[in-house]
């Protein structure tokens, strides 16, 4: 099985024990590590951070001791802007320039492939996204002709049904991608006005339309029905939780909220907590399991957080094995307890290790 793990370059800027550099990663933990994110400047793939080249080197030296490790560079991301991607993909010349720029950049910096993180194509972009993938793959095939190992091509896709329908021609893009990472998280947000888990495995008992689509099982099944081969589908598992501020004494699933949860000490983003921050939160918190959805949540005071733990990730891995998927994807290594100092197990990357162990178990 593949274990595809994202590392985010901006995690270097977190304070103190939250700061993560690629040399802190475990070279034997994942089969693939994806560095997020690269930029596109003047239609050419480019660095984003001032020290990206140094960090690329740090990451790719992990392969010295584990030659089976594959590294990919992810281009795009939330801050890149969907329209910027759209304009490159929709213009024949811009698209060609971008595609041509990718192989030399990846080779120069020691990457084994490219991950497309167009978040997200709109209605106008569905065909262009397919064309971009098809032409990128053709370029990778052509570039490998002189006996080089062919560069890998993957894409991170939304797990939301509406976005899948409007943005992706799943059957066509699946033909050209080596694997597809489906982002089976962020199903529930503060805008709903109630608590709810952001990455449930199954549909909740109370879920009505459109909530019935907002779970991992539905998203994976839908992708398969649309023509994604199970052998290319990699299922996303988050090492972060989504938090809410409760608006009343109710604390269960569906309880009213006043907004997102308070920011974490290190990640500093309202409504989001890294797993290592959740381990801190759990001291003195009350933990519940949403039985049907097979995921936990915890409450403390007026704070509510839905997250994944070692038990829930094992359930998710068993599920992906039952569906004969290609493996698991983790967002992100730097949100796991990468130092092993927060979660009291003397184990670095406890969640990702639990996924790895479950994938290896017979």
């Amino acid at each position: 099985y593949k274990l595809v793990c994202y590392y985010t370059s901006w995690s270097q800027y977190r304070e103190g024990d939250g700061s993560c550099f690629p040399d802190a990663l475990d070279r034997f933990l994942c089969t693939h590590i994806i560095y997020s994110f690269a930029n596109i400047s003047n239609d050419h793939i480019d660095t984003w951070e001032w020290n990206d080249v140094t960090l690329y080197g740090m990451l790719n030296t992990l392969k010295n001791r584990n030659p089976n490790l594959k590294t990919l560079l992810s281009v795009g991301g939330w801050n890149f802007g969907s329209q910027r991607f759209s304009k490159i993909a929709s213009n024949t010349q811009s698209r060609r320039t971008f595609i041509k720029s990718v192989p030399p950049f990846l080779r120069t910096h020691g990457f084994d492939g490219l991950d497309l993180a167009w978040l997200y194509p709109g209605r106008r972009d569905k065909q262009h996204f397919t064309t971009l993938i098809k032409e990128m793959k053709a370029e990778f095939i052509k570039e490998a002709q002189p006996g080089k190992k062919q560069l890998l091509l993957s894409a991170a896709l939304s797990a939301g049904k509406v976005t899948i329908d409007s943005s992706y021609d799943i059957a066509k893009i699946s033909q050209h991608l080596d694997f597809i990472s489906i982002m089976t998280y962020d199903f529930h947000g503060a805008w709903r006005g109630t608590t709810g888990h952001h990455s449930p495995l199954f549909r909740g008992q109370e879920d009505a339309s459109p909530d019935r689509f907002s779970n991992t099982d539905y998203a994976v099944g839908y992708m398969l029905r649309l023509g994604a081969p199970a052998s290319k589908l990699v299922m996303g598992i988050p090492t972060f939780g989504r938090s809410f501020t409760l608006a009343s004494s109710e604390t269960g699933v569906g309880a009213p909220i006043s907004g997102p949860g308070i920011p974490g000490r290190f990640t500093k983003e309202a409504g989001t907590l890294a797993y290592y921050e959740i381990c801190d939160f759990l001291r003195g918190a009350t933990v519940h399991r949403i039985l049907g959805q097979q995921v936990p949540y915890a409450t403390k005071g007026n704070q509510w957080v839905g997250y994944d733990d070692q038990e829930s990730v094992k359930s998710k891995v068993q599920y992906l094995k039952d569906r004969q998927l290609a493996g698991a994807m983790v967002w992100a290594l730097d949100l796991d307890d990468f130092q092993g100092s927060f979660c009291g197990q003397d184990l670095r990357f406890p969640l990702t290790n639990a996924i790895k162990d479950a994938l290896a178990a017979t």
Partner: antibody, heavy 123, light 111 residues
């Protein structure tokens, strides 16, 4: 054919509230993001607010943030703009407009507009 | 937030060509699509150009759009001017959850 019909405009005193409605027909309302755009007398167009197809995301112009609330009822094919703490500078024709996209991240454009409803804020 | 600056007014004779410019104050004009809307008195606005240079169905091919990265601006060109083209024209673009309009250009068709 696509039709957008605004209503709820009128004369209102500063500091008071007003709710505009936009009745949509001729298309699947729940498959499109929707906007409010206004034009003050003798001035240009100004974008006011947007809401995604399912109401999950909403954005506002700085000039109305904290005072105006955009919402939608997909079962009634209707878009709303709740305007509180109205000011003289909010006097304008308010247009409801359909976005070409469902979500807000891809920044669609306004492909259909209503005829507008006039809001006058005056004491 | 960025701004889009248009000339206040332009005028030209029937049959001639007119170009209306739209300059972006910050951020690249090439990073986001530009639209152009026509607004006639008493009518709802209509789109004459979308996605920089695309004409929606029903818009005559006398209307064309382009962008120029070197001047960080977009242009609407109307050739073979007709009296019915007299209207206000607005450019519009998007960035980071803001939909921004230019100040508008009044096109007067002389004669």
């Amino acid at each position: 054919q696509v039709q957008l019909v605004e209503s709820g405009g009128g004369v209102v005193q500063p500091g008071r509230s007003l709710r505009l409605s936009c009745a949509a027909s001729g298309f699947t309302f729940s498959s499109y993001a929707m906007h409010w755009v206004r034009q003050a007398p003798g001035k240009g167009l100004e974008w006011v607010a947007v809401i995604s197809y399912d109401g999950s995301n909403k954005y506002y112009a700085d000039s109305v943030k904290g005072r105006f609330t955009i919402s939608r009822d997909n079962s009634k094919n209707t878009l709303y703009l709740q305007m509180n703490s109205l000011r003289a500078e909010d006097t304008a024709v308010y247009y409801c407009a359909r976005d070409t996209e469902l979500q807000l991240w891809s920044g669609g454009y306004f492909d259909y507009w209503g005829q507008g409803t006039l809001v006058t804020v005056s004491s | 937030n960025f701004m889009l600056t248009q000339p206040h007014s332009v005028s030209e004779s029937p049959g001639k060509t007119v170009i209306i410019s739209c300059t972006r104050s910050s951020g690249s004009i090439a990073h986001n699509y530009v639209q152009w809307y026509q607004l006639r008195p008493g009518s709802a606005p209509t789109t004459v150009i979308s996605d920089d240079d695309q004409r929606p169905s029903g818009v005559p091919d006398r209307f064309s759009g382009s962008i120029d990265s070197s001047s960080n601006s977009a242009s609407l060109t109307i050739s073979g001017l007709r009296t019915e083209d007299e209207a206000d024209y607005y450019c519009q673009s998007f960035d980071d959850s803001n939909w921004v309009f230019g100040g508008g250009t009044r096109l007067t068709v002389l004669g």
